[in-house]
């Protein structure tokens, strides 16, 4: 493994780690966030950060109800300096080898430099490659959408389903939820799971005549994909009198493995590629988004990808006291690491973002997962948090409980759009969920004291059970809407924090070695699961679980 | 910048061989289908043989047989090897590469390939 981006092995040998510790002893632990407030009439305005998007629409991030004063900031960003975040941001957007155990470049920021501007990796100027592509895909999203693209009996495409996995399905997914109130034109499904129930659901809804297939498998071996995709070809030669010639009308690839493409029976015209520095949980900004860009119009899908651009330029631009993504990256270390807290919670005022936890929990916890830095060394500190969340106000029926009155500290954004798509009832929805988002975010901070409870009239062993204890920290995310550009800016910032823990942390964000092991004993297991002799070659419980399954199946 | 080199050209008699050679630099060559192509005095270019990224290849009618064409993704470069060259494989050789996931192709300047006696 290369090192060469850090010159330190473990976050704790910074001289800013130690500090913060002395920080979080003396004033920390016991700070208090209203009575910040009182001290300090500014506080509000020093902590909060607008972001202006290309198309001039706002995102307005409160940190400020965060257990953190101007020390303690200070603080955080001497950590930056010293971990050399800036340093190692500068070599990923220069498309240096950042993913040192894979030896590559980290470069889904080239995916989104719609200015054009030369980006490069080993030598190559990337840029016209990746607009070469973009171009493809929306030559190719305009003419199924307006119903040039036929399908092989000259209907035109209604439905599209796009087959893949994690990165390939995830990002994809999300996206099209959150961005549904844009869309109109074709109906989207999508189909991961390996069950069999999840391709055998989605193909009673569609038609063959008017479906299309998007297959999303970079190397096009991707064990579930695969086995999705030949059930999906099945489904449709059986269905269409066995005619190989009538795949190339319903079936596209988003891989680079032209020869299995071709075998596959799909025209590799309709294939569209990214490169080995677009990591899967990154890849929705690639040829992995054209189910997007088929969804909602490759206009829509461009202004997405101009969102994200435009938070790359403020992450890279920014001094460090005004950048949003590293303020975002930091606090989340000074939970994780000084307070011992353990979970991240997003939960997003607004129903088109119901998946979009979902996605942060990938991006977050598959790139920050790790225990050993890139100095090769186990960690001595904790690394990625927990990522969890739901839409409220569902989530304040659920388990918004154990956020106010549980034992575990849980840091949360909370994400609202001023103006909602459905503004129904004369805003009435809009404006009960927004004081809800206002209400939960105050309530975390400022608790219930006993002489409160008391005063409502509560007495005896009831009065502490209704006790909010407070000071428990948000970060309220404020957009005007959810557009396609603030969805991309969106996702940008919450890269960029994922980035900043991780560079912090000293560990490689960009690969995920913890996915191989399972993958490679499903493989000896499906061998065994073929036969009906009784296994005995695990361990006693997996044994027993394996026989057990065979005698049902 | 992208710049695509032919070399290997010249003059060879009839029944000979040469082995034409394009090196690229300022693309992702494991991208690219790359082909060669050619064209006679007076003529249109046309076609000789093409190797896609997964290396899969394709030739003129009037290549098959004689001409192989190969790709070497670790050094960026294709090269074609032909034999039993006869007077009308006389023309001005390019390099060609297309990129395999969107519109977008470069050509190189050419080398000439004379076959007489």
């Known amino acids: 493994s290369n090192n060469s981006f850090t010159n330190f092995k473990l976050a704790t040998e910074l001289p800013a780690w130690s500090k913060l510790q002395k920080i979080y002893e003396s004033q920390g632990k016991t700070l208090s966030v209203k009575q910040e407030f009182q001290k300090d009439a500014k506080r509000f305005e020093k902590l909060n950060k607008t972001f202006t998007n290309y198309d001039g629409s706002k995102i307005l991030f409160d940190y400020s109800k965060n257990l953190v004063n101007d020390e303690i900031i200070a603080a955080l960003i001497e950590l930056a300096k010293e971990a050399n975040v800036t340093g190692l941001r500068d070599a990923m957007f220069k498309g240096e080898h950042i993913n040192s155990t894979e030896d590559r470049a980290v470069y889904h920021v080239a995916l989104r430099n719609r200015a054009n501007k030369p980006m490069y990796v080993d030598g190559v100027n990337v840029a016209p490659e990746v607009d070469s592509v973009l171009k493809h895909m929306k030559e190719f999203s305009e003419q199924v959408r307006s119903g040039e693209w036929k399908g092989y009996t000259g209907k035109k495409i209604t439905d599209v389903v796009n087959i893949g996995i994690g990165g390939s399905d995830l990002g994809p997914v999300m996206v099209t939820e959150a961005l549904k109130h844009y869309a109109g034109v074709l109906d989207v499904h999508f189909v991961s799971n390996i069950d069999g129930t999840h391709i055998a659901e989605t193909l009673k809804v569609v038609d063959p005549e008017t479906t299309l297939f998007l297959i999303a498998s970079k190397t096009f071996t991707t064990a579930e994909t695969i086995t999705n995709a030949n059930t999906a070809k099945n489904w449709f030669l059986s269905k269409t009198g066995n005619d190989p010639s009538h795949i190339a009308k319903h079936f596209a690839a988003l891989s680079t493995n032209e020869t299995e493409v071709a075998k596959f029976g799909i025209d590799t015209k309709n294939m569209f590629g990214f490169e080995s520095w677009v990591g899967g949980r990154y890849s929705v900004w690639s040829a992995i988004g054209l189910s997007v860009a088929l969804y909602i119009g490759y206009d829509n899908f461009e202004a997405f990808l101009k969102g994200a651009e435009a938070v790359d330029n403020h992450f890279t631009q920014t001094p460090l006291e005004d950048n949003i993504p590293l303020l975002g990256g930091l606090l989340s270390v000074w939970y994780n690491n000084f307070f011992g807290a353990q979970t991240h919670l997003v939960a997003p005022f607004d129903q088109y973002l119901h998946r979009f936890p979902a996605y942060l929990q990938q991006l977050s916890m598959e790139s920050n997962g790790k225990s050993v830095t890139r100095g090769n060394v186990f960690t001595d500190y904790s690394t990625g948090s927990i990522l969890f969340g739901e839409p409220a106000t569902n989530a304040q029926h659920s388990f918004f409980q154990l956020v106010h009155q549980g034992t575990k500290l849980i840091p949360s954004d909370f994400i609202l759009a001023a103006q909602s798509h459905n503004p129904i009832e004369n805003k009435l929805h809009q404006k009960m969920l927004a004081s809800n988002f206002f209400a939960q975010a105050e309530a975390l901070m400022v608790g219930k004291d006993e002489e409160q409870v008391k005063a409502e009239g509560a007495t005896g062993g009831l009065v502490p059970h209704k006790v909010f204890s407070g000071n428990r920290p948000t970060t309220s995310i404020l957009a005007q809407k959810i557009t396609p550009a603030t969805l991309g800016a969106l996702i940008a910032y919450y890269e960029h924090v994922t980035f900043t823990e991780g560079a912090i942390w000293n560990i490689n964000s960009f690969d995920q070695w913890g996915v191989e092991l399972g993958k490679v004993l499903a493989k000896v297991i499906g061998k065994e699961l073929d036969n009906s002799s009784t296994i005995s070659t695990h361990d006693a419980s997996t044994n027993g679980l394996i026989n057990q399954f065979k005698e049902w199946m | 910048q992208v710049q695509l080199v032919e070399s290997g050209g010249g003059l060879v008699r009839p029944g000979g061989s040469l082995r034409l050679s394009c090196a690229a630099s300022g693309i992702t060559f494991s991208s690219y289908t790359m082909g060669w192509y050619r064209q006679a005095p007076g003529k249109q270019r046309e076609l000789v043989a093409t190797i896609t990224t997964g290396g899969s290849t394709n030739y003129a009618v009037s290549a098959k047989g004689r001409f192989t064409i190969s790709r070497d993704n670790a050094n960026n470069r294709v090269t074609l090897q032909m034999n039993s060259l006869n007077s009308e494989d006389t023309a001005a050789y390019y390099c060609?590469?297309?990129?395999?996931?969107?519109?977008?192709?470069?050509w190189g300047q050419g080398t000439q390939v004379t076959v007489s006696s």
């Open positions: 060609h590469s297309r990129f395999a996931y969107g519109p977008l192709e470069y």
